[in-house]
Interface confidence: low
């Protein structure tokens, strides 16, 4: 059976606010849930949609959401269906409306001493309470011959007299909120002695140093008085003008003229008319100074032929609102065609190359004119001036590959080497004309190069093969100083490369020939058994036909390689005693001995009083401490080779003899006793 765990319930809701009708179902099999409103299925919209099994309202609408909602769960296999309890919204709302004349039937029938009834068409749920205003001042019930019927939303004036003339408005508020009349009613009951507006001043916008005119006329019997005030209630008359309004003139017909307007003249001007009876009538108008700001700069634009593009001109801030138009080559653009103005936009349809150039957006108002140019480039596909050519480049010298193209805008050129993009570094430079420079050509630069020249309109590419003309060079150059071990076999290699495979041969530097036990085998000098006489200067000569010859000089030294006669051993010493680490090496040239302790070389000149290195190479440390413990390395070296050997030194506390031990029992370590 289908069971509702949560059912929708009727609830209060606010117009335009969120709401949720909950529904949760439990069933043995899969069910699908949908909603009904007054028996009809509810379709999902952006405003009202299913959220899981529940129904969500993004903004409750008093018209579309009034009615009875029901959640329906259906098992499509068994056909079983269950319906939730009904739920509805109590929607709270308030809506503005106009103030209308209810009685008499038309304004023409309003006469002094007749009853006038106005209705406030603000509605809402719950019913709001109403407040009436005349000329912005609240009216209270039972005051000055009027009654307010809150229930009927009516204001009754009985009888209506000239003193009731004015602009009537209403506001209403309820639990939902507040609204005021969307349109107000002007009640005009003539009293000849009351001042009436004949001509009201209008807001004006003028350019600096121009003149401004405000017109103002009232009528009454007898004629009313008229007075002008500026901002701070300063009266303006032809006899007494405030300092900043020296250029103000009030005419007999009530008009006010301001000449050579300056910023300080901007503000609110009040024209006050006063009849023999009745309240003064105050009319306001504002004098604004025209202004126009600068226009923002345009970025240059690049478009492709055949496309449609738009350039928006943001008008500068200004008062009055500046008018905007586009010009090209000094001619104003039309509002239709292929290149035209639409609103503030410049539209270029099916762009042609000839559309390129400078377009100008103009903006103007009373304060002046502003203009801003936009440079439009119509991109073209690059064309070749010079393609890269298959090239032979010399190793070690700069090499150049051309990729000269032309297009609008200037094309961007990138180079690839073996399909890999070449990023500029100290070896490669792409000149602004597209030429690739290889600063110092290397053998492995011999490969395929491809250049691609692009603009927004498209790209072209071409490739070329580079062949590197190798230098005649030793690979690697022989070490200038080499050692051979006396009485042993030795080889000294020498190899070279070039455009043609070079011939390699060895000779003694003094020009003498090699002894028979020394052979020169394809550039490798081979000594079957090294003798003292084999020491000396040798020259390796590499040569080929096109490149001539190169020489490398090698000084060979014959040496007896280093061996250790005495090596240091693992040593344990009592704290405060003396440690001796022995080391003696032999070889020719006679090796020098250095010691390294605790990962640093022990400098014989900076050893201090506790340490000493003997002539034979042994290291002595007096008054040893625990921190002297560690590995000590004896390094023996001469100009031909270097060897090292190491041993640990342990520094231990001297044990206190126990009673049970005899006087002659040995210590628990292999000790050096001093």
């Amino acid at each position: 059976a289908i069971v509702f765990i949560k059912q929708p319930s009727s609830q209060d809701a606010l117009q335009g606010r969120r709401a949720l009708l909950r529904c949760e179902v439990e069933a043995p099999g899969p069910v699908h849930v949908y909603w009904l409103l007054d028996g009809a299925p509810v379709q999902d919209t952006e405003r009202r949609f299913a959220q899981g099994s529940s129904l969500s309202f993004a903004a409750v609408d008093r018209l579309q959401d009034s009615g009875t909602f029901q959640c329906v769960a259906r098992d499509d296999v068994t056909g079983e269906e269950a319906r939730s309890a009904n739920a509805s919204f109590n929607i709270k709302w308030i809506e503005a409306g106009p103030v209308v004349l209810k009685h008499p039937a038309s304004e023409a029938e309003i006469q002094p001493q007749t009853q006038v009834t106005l209705r406030c068409h603000i509605d809402g749920h719950p019913r709001p309470t109403y407040q009436w205003f005349r000329d912005g001042t609240p009216l209270s019930d039972g005051q000055s011959n009027h009654t307010v019927s809150s229930k009927e939303r009516n204001l009754t004036l009985r009888p209506a007299g000239p003193e009731h003339s004015g602009l009537y408005s209403c506001c209403a508020h309820s639990a939902f909120g507040q609204a005021c009349s969307s349109q107000n009613f002007t009640l005009s009951i003539a009293d000849e002695s009351f001042a009436r507006v004949v001509l009201a001043p209008q807001d004006v916008v003028v350019a600096r140093y121009e003149e401004a005119m405000f017109h103002c006329q009232f009528s009454a019997q007898p004629p009313p008085s008229l007075q002008w005030l500026f901002e701070d209630e300063t009266p303006i008359t032809n006899r007494s003008r405030p300092p900043h309004l020296r250029r103000a003139t009030v005419f007999a017909n009530g008009s006010l003229l301001l000449t050579q307007v300056r910023p300080r003249n901007a503000g609110i001007y009040r024209c006050i008319g006063q009849g023999q009876r009745g309240p003064p009538i105050i009319l306001e108008a504002t004098l604004h100074l025209a202004e126009i700001e600068d226009m923002p700069l345009f970025e240059p634009r690049v478009f492709t032929a055949g496309s449609e593009e738009r350039v928006t001109c943001l008008p500068p801030k200004g008062l009055p609102e500046p008018s905007v138009w586009w010009e090209h080559a000094g001619v104003r653009l039309p509002t239709h065609g292929r290149v035209y103005q639409k609103g503030h936009e410049l539209v270029l349809a099916n762009i042609a190359e000839s559309d390129a150039g400078v377009y100008t957006c103009h903006a103007a108002n009373l304060a002046g004119q502003r203009r801003q140019d936009v440079n439009i480039t119509v991109a073209t596909v690059p064309s070749w001036l010079k393609k890269p050519q298959d090239s032979q480049l010399e190793e070690g010298k700069p090499g150049y590959l051309d990729c000269l193209t032309q297009a609008t805008p200037k094309p961007t050129v990138v180079w690839y080497r073996n399909q890999m993009l070449i990023s500029e570094d100290s070896r490669f430079e792409v000149f602004k004309n597209g030429t690739l420079r290889i600063n110092s050509v290397e053998v492995y630069d011999g490969t395929w190069y491809r250049c691609m020249s692009s603009t927004p309109a498209g790209s072209i590419e071409a490739q070329a093969r580079v062949q590197v003309l190798e230098k005649l060079k030793f690979t690697p150059p022989p070490q200038p100083q080499q050692c051979m071990e006396f009485d042993k076999e030795a080889t000294v290699p020498c190899s070279a490369t070039g455009r043609e495979k070079p011939t390699i041969k060895w000779e003694r530097a003094d020009g003498s020939s090699l002894p028979e036990w020394v052979t020169d085998n394809a550039g490798t000098l081979h000594f079957a058994r090294v003798t003292r006489d084999d020491a000396g200067n040798y020259t390796c000569i590499a040569s080929n036909g096109p490149q001539g010859q190169i020489r490398a000089h090698v000084q060979l030294t014959v040496a007896v390689f280093i061996t250790f006669k005495v090596e240091p051993e693992r040593t344990t010493v009592y704290q405060g005693h003396t440690a001796l680490l022995q080391c003696e090496a032999q070889g020719d040239p006679k090796p020098l001995i250095q010691w390294k302790g605790k990962d640093r070389i022990l400098d014989p000149t900076k050893l201090g009083p506790r340490m000493h290195i003997f002539q034979n190479g042994s290291l002595v440390i007096h008054d040893v401490a625990p921190e002297d413990s560690g590995r000590y390395t004896c390094i023996a070296g001469n100009s031909c080779n270097i060897k090292h050997t190491e041993a640990p030194l342990y520094v231990v506390d001297k044990p206190v003899p126990e009673e049970s031990e005899g006087p002659g029992s040995p210590p628990p370590y292999k000790m050096i006793q001093t």
Partner: antibody, heavy 120, light 107 residues
Framework: QITLKESGPTLVKPTQTLTLTCTFS??????????VGWIRQPPGKALEWLAH???????YYSPSLKSRLTITKDTSKNQVVLTMTNMDPVDTATYYC????????????WGQGTLVTVSS | DIQMTQSPSSLSASVGDRVTITCKAS??????LNWFQQKPGKAPKTLIY???RLLDGVPSRFSGSGSGTDFTFTISSLQPEDIATYYC?????????FGAGTKLEIK
């Protein structure tokens, strides 16, 4: 560490010839892409480029001063020499030598400058 | 010759402000533009080369951008030690030409 140092007279008479030497270390003018140039700055004024020489002896001069300038290099001594003929008081300035690396950062290294006053 | 128009010629800003200097070339100079800083009595020091590449050891608050003819140098947050005159230089072609300089002062 790359350093450049200018040397030469601090006072020159009008119509005389100025010879300035730039001695540098930390790089070699025999290395591909290396170049040395001269720039001057009259007191309180902007910088003005004078001349430039590259590792391959390629030379460039300011067009307005070309007839008066000569730039040479001595690779073995790590020196570049600038001579300027027919000196005038308007040539009073601090003269700097600079290193440039073709394809990398031009003028990344400057000498401290030497003030040359032209006065009789 | 390529003319380099640098603006503004002087500028006063507060510590922490973002400061922008521009250089306009009389023709396309590709990305070949450097920015230098010069403090009184000292040789100029290169900050940026090839429009936007920071030389080693130059603080990251300095940056450069632009292409073609319009280039911008920015200090994202001005520090007291940034008070100096700044110059741009084009090295797209000889003769090399500098901007007239922008003198930066602290308010």
């Amino acid at each position: 560490q790359i350093t450049l140092k200018e040397s030469g007279p601090t006072l020159v008479k009008p119509t005389q010839t100025l010879t300035l030497t730039c001695t540098f270390s930390g790089f070699s003018l025999s290395t591909s892409n290396m170049g040395v140039g001269w720039i001057r700055q009259p007191p309180g004024k902007a910088l003005e480029w004078l001349a430039h020489i590259w590792w391959d002896d390629d030379k460039y001069y300011s067009p307005s001063l070309k007839s008066r300038l000569t730039i040479t290099k001595d690779t073995s001594k790590n020196q570049v020499v600038l001579t300027m003929t027919n000196m005038d008081p308007v040539d009073t300035a601090t003269y700097y030598c600079v290193r440039s690396n073709y394809g990398y950062a031009w003028f990344a290294y400057w000498g401290q400058g030497t003030l040359v006053t032209v006065s009789s | 010759d390529i003319q380099m128009t640098q603006s503004p010629s002087s500028l006063s800003a507060s510590v922490g402000d973002r400061v922008t200097i521009t250089c306009k070339a009389s023709q396309d100079i590709y990305p070949y533009l450097n920015w230098f800083q010069q403090k009184p009595g000292k040789a100029p020091k290169t900050l940026i080369y090839r429009t936007n590449r920071l030389l080693d050891g130059v603080p990251s608050r300095f940056s450069g951008s632009g292409s073609g003819t319009d280039f911008t140098f920015t200090i994202s947050s001005l520090q007291p030690e940034d008070i100096a005159t700044y110059y741009c230089l084009q090295y797209d072609e000889f003769p090399l030409t500098f901007g007239a300089g922008t003198k930066l002062e602290i308010k």
